[in-house]
């Protein structure tokens, strides 16, 4: 007789999550001499042990911490990036500009970088057919629960000027129901980080309007500003040229507003 | 600005204790978890210990649990960590820095505890 099995509204996990998982931290330990020490065993392990058996809908930031404890990692604070709905174009700059990082670009943020998981409870099965939905569902799931304690963590190691990039193209350019805007604006800490400086990422090339004018901006400042930390703000009316630029800062053309 | 300067590290038999010291200055110390972190010869960052603001809370590595104890005293902006029975694997450089990690920023040089026979 086939187990009943919950049907949550959400995809499943990702196919070979666990092959996944272990190939991507074996890659990251190769590319990243300073982290040659970690044991990809014993990551996957911790992960693992953070979801499965366990109720999808009962997950928790202290059942992650084992795993939090062997990601340890050495980040320069002053060099942090965060990103909202923008990750492609983060992603692509931190690959250009080396010494800047975004989530992604630690151990933990790589391994889990796009994909989905969760189990049973009382079983040691992975359910590959559904997950929980963040709205539909709940929103203590493997994956939230997942991307708020390693987001809350690294908005917490932040310092100095802090860089924010956001999508121009949005009817809001600032969610307060994004993860950056639920999580990581309020893990700031006032004491450690003197300044967020927002990017904001224009779509149409004929775009000439000032976007840091924007009201969801302007909501942005204000919630920065109440928590003692300065705001400035930046359009990038070419991201492509903008690009360029950080390849190549010499070029003449890259003296003009971006 | 954050600021940490760590002491006390040294050279120990095996078995041996130490307690290091870190002296903390530039925020509010009871704000912040603090933590040790490690650094042995050739090696990557290793997490160590993590104890809450009020000092009411405290978490260690597997390797170092029921050898090292962390404290702090709130009163003197001071982070301790310490050490008994110390191994060789003990040995490396050692940071204290805020947060509870896993990303961490050290500041200061650290204390260099080497564990020989």
């Known amino acids: 007789v086939p187990r009943w099995r919950q049907q949550w509204s959400g995809p499943g996990t990702t196919k070979r999550f666990p092959e996944t998982v272990l190939a991507r931290c074996v890659k990251y330990t190769e590319i990243h001499p300073e982290m040659r020490h970690v044991d990809c065993q014993s990551v996957w392990d911790a992960f693992k042990g953070a979801f499965i058996s366990k109720h999808p809908c009962n997950i928790t930031e202290e059942d992650y911490q084992p795993l939090m404890k062997l990601g340890t990692q050495t980040v320069p604070c002053n060099k942090i990036l965060l990103w909202s709905r923008i990750k492609d174009l983060a992603h692509q700059f931190t690959q250009v500009q080396r010494d800047m990082f975004t989530l992604e670009d630690t151990l933990l943020g790589y391994l889990a970088d796009d994909l989905t998981w969760c189990g049973e409870f009382n079983t040691s099965k992975i359910n590959y057919q559904s997950c929980p939905d963040w709205r539909k569902d709940c929103s203590n799931n493997p994956v939230s629960v997942f991307w708020k304690t390693v987001s809350r963590r690294f908005a917490e190691a932040a310092c100095d000027v802090v860089h924010v990039m956001l999508n121009g193209s949005r009817s809001k350019i600032f969610d307060k129901n994004s993860t950056f805007g639920s999580v990581e604006v309020h893990n700031l800490q006032p004491e450690k980080v003197q300044t967020l400086e927002a990017w904001v990422i224009h779509g149409g090339r004929e775009d000439s309007r000032d976007l840091c004018q924007d009201p969801t901006i302007k909501e942005l400042e204000s919630i920065i500003s109440k928590r003692n930390i300065q705001f400035s703000c930046k359009n990038i009316y070419r991201p492509d040229k903008f690009l360029q630029c950080v390849k190549n800062p010499e070029d003449s053309s890259c003296t003009s507003e971006i | 600005e954050v600021q940490v300067l760590e002491s006390g590290g040294g050279l120990v038999q095996p078995g041996d204790s130490l307690r290091l010291s870190c002296a903390a200055s530039g925020f509010t110390f009871t704000n912040f978890a603090m933590s040790w972190v490690r650094q042995a010869p050739g090696k990557g960052l290793e997490w160590v210990s993590t104890i809450s603001g009020s000092g009411g809370s405290t978490d260690y590595a597997d390797s170092v649990k029921g050898r090292f104890t962390i404290s702090r005293d709130n009163s003197k902006n001071m982070l301790y960590l310490q050490m008994n029975s110390l191994r060789a694997e003990d040995t490396a450089v050692y940071y204290c820095?805020?947060?509870?990690?896993?990303?961490?920023?050290?500041r200061g040089q650290g204390t260099l505890v080497t564990v020989s026979s």
């Open positions: 820095a805020d947060g509870r990690g896993p990303f961490f920023d050290y």
